[in-house]
């Protein structure tokens, strides 16, 4: 996988009036490493790993850059003509990548009320607009405004990409995204019994890199896909990931089942707890992933936040 740096910015308008401030997140190699504190108007580290490795200068620079980007996005939102009453959002996702062969990519994507209307390749300056008439209108609106704005020249796009790549290289050198291996912690829990069946859940947490195999086995043989339910592999905010797999088994057959995990050349099998352990663990069956921080703001405002 290539190394990547991604910024996610959003501005809001209420009844035609663009709200002050903006929302922002930064991801390094898919891991959240930056959040923008709207109250303090500062970029801050997300997770201990970013805090430990990246110095104060990083957050000063990121604050300046995000403030400028946020202002640009707010000005762009003011020029979107079709704003009816109610709450509206304009979101920009900017990504730059360094691939294994040292080639680079850069792009940015714009969403209005959660709908993609414009994608730009920062290296070729090519734009892509979805077929819908709404997207076409929005894209024309925005690009016309940019044409009037001297800053939005080809040189500006090139600088934008160069700046992003420069940061990415600096962060990688700082060791934030060192390709270290952190083996998963695996635990198996059982839910309440219903109709003689038990739901067994196997959770892997705090692992890096992201790729993992997690599957239930019966008598040493993998269960078929349609008898298992998998959770997404999600960042846990500490530079590592978490995921889960669940299946239903007949009560009394616990000994036949193991959770098999394979990660970065290591593997392990984890049995289903039985007897007292089964009862003790039975409460820990929540399969829902709760989003914290910025996402709560978007959810509260019923705004679709594109990852």
């Amino acid at each position: 996988e290539p190394h990547s740096l991604r910024y996610n910015l959003m501005v809001l308008s209420q009844d035609g009036s663009v709200q002050s401030g903006f929302l922002a997140e930064g991801h390094l190699d898919g891991q959240p490493f930056l959040r923008y504190d709207r109250q303090k108007r500062r970029a801050k580290p997300q997770g201990q790993w970013a805090e430990d490795v990246l110095g104060a200068k990083t957050w000063d620079t990121e604050t300046e850059d995000l403030t400028e980007n946020g202002q640009d996005l707010r000005r762009t939102l003011t020029h979107i003509k079709d704003q009816k009453g109610g709450l509206h959002s304009l979101q920009e996702i900017r990504v730059c990548e360094i691939h294994e062969d040292s080639s680079t990519r850069g792009s940015r994507h714009f969403y209005y009320d959660g709908e993609l209307f414009l994608s730009q390749n920062l290296e070729t300056q090519e734009s892509t607009v979805p077929q819908s008439s709404r997207a076409q209108t929005l894209a024309m609106n925005v690009t016309n405004f940019w044409k009037e704005d001297a800053m939005k020249t080809k040189t500006h796009y090139r600088a934008m990409q160069a700046d992003c790549l420069q940061k990415l290289q600096r962060y990688l050198k700082s060791g934030v995204a060192i390709r270290r291996t952190v083996p998963p912690m695996v635990n198996v829990t059982c839910s309440e019994v219903s109709e003689g069946n038990i739901t067994v859940t196997c959770r892997a947490s705090s692992f890096y890199p992201r790729n993992i195999t997690l599957t239930w086995r019966q008598d040493g043989v993998s269960l078929s896909h349609n008898t298992q339910q998998w959770g997404d592999v999600l960042p846990d905010g500490n530079g590592t990931y978490q995921t889960w797999v669940a299946t239903r088994i007949r009560q009394g057959e616990e000994q036949r089942f193991t959770c098999y995990m394979e990660h970065s050349g290591n593997h392990g099998t984890h049995p289903v707890p039985s007897g007292k352990a089964l009862v003790l663990q039975s409460q820990r069956t929540d399969h829902h992933h709760h989003h914290h921080g910025l996402n709560d703001i978007f959810e509260a405002q019923k705004i679709e936040w594109h990852e």
């Epitope: 086995r217 008598d219 040493g220 043989v221 993998s222 057959e253 000994q255 036949r256 193991t258 098999y260 593997h267 392990g268 099998t269 984890h270 049995p271």
Partner: antibody, heavy 118, light 107 residues
């Protein structure tokens, strides 16, 4: 390729015990279960039990509980089956087998003949 | 325990014949049925797993079918090297159980 090499034939006296070994090669030993199967002369196959080499967890056929004990030595990638209090009924060929994670008894050892005779 | 019955203990066929070996379980085994080949020297190989899935390296002349309690193994074009005893085995319920075997001979 996956190979299971079993120990040689054993001639043992009634009441004695025997330990049959099964050395695995060609794959990561702790990834897959080792199963044991008995075949009495001219008869069908009977499943004895299995062991998970990663954590030593065992599951036995009720019929062989107390008769067979399954163990592994991870350092030598070897599985063992210990049979105790032997009688003529225990005279048989014993097979070890492993899985590829998709089917039971995917690969088999060549078998070990155990003869119980006074 | 689930009983696995192979009613035909031995079967004679000519080279090139289509041969079917059947196996019945004493209760529904939900397709968890495997077939093994045991050569006269005692060597055992997996042929078919989960009723009809061909194990890698097994010639395509072998096929499996069935459901519920009734299953069969078919050899579409019998070859000399197929002379062996064939066992069915259920993997649905512990203890795993095998059929008594069907010995295949050449006419």
């Amino acid at each position: 390729q996956v190979q299971l090499q079993q120990s040689g034939p054993e001639l043992v006296k009634p009441g004695a015990s025997v330990k049959v070994s099964c050395k695995a090669s060609g794959y990561a030993f702790t990834k897959y279960n080792i199963y044991w199967v008995k075949q009495s002369h001219g008869k069908s196959l009977e499943w004895i039990g299995y062991i998970d080499p990663y954590n030593g967890g065992t599951v036995y056929n009720q019929k062989f509980k107390g008769k067979a004990t399954l163990t592994v030595d991870k350092s030598s990638s070897t599985a063992y089956m210990h049979l105790n209090s032997l009688t003529s009924e225990d005279s048989a060929v014993y097979y070890c087998a492993t899985t590829d994670g998709y089917s039971l008894f995917t690969y088999w050892g060549q078998g070990t003949l155990v003869t119980v005779s006074a | 325990d689930i009983q696995m019955t192979q009613t035909t203990s031995s079967l004679s066929a000519s080279l090139g014949d289509r041969v079917t070996i059947s196996c019945r379980a004493s209760q529904d085994i939900s397709n968890y049925l495997n077939w093994y080949q045991q050569k006269p020297d005692g060597t055992v190989k997996l042929l078919i797993y989960y009723t009809s899935r061909l194990h890698s390296g097994v010639p395509s002349r072998f096929s499996g079918s069935g459901s519920g309690t009734d299953y069969s193994l078919t050899i579409s074009n019998l070859e000399q090297e197929d002379i062996a005893t064939y066992f069915c085995q259920q993997g649905n319920t512990l203890p795993f159980t095998f059929g008594s075997g069907t010995k295949l001979e050449i006419k």
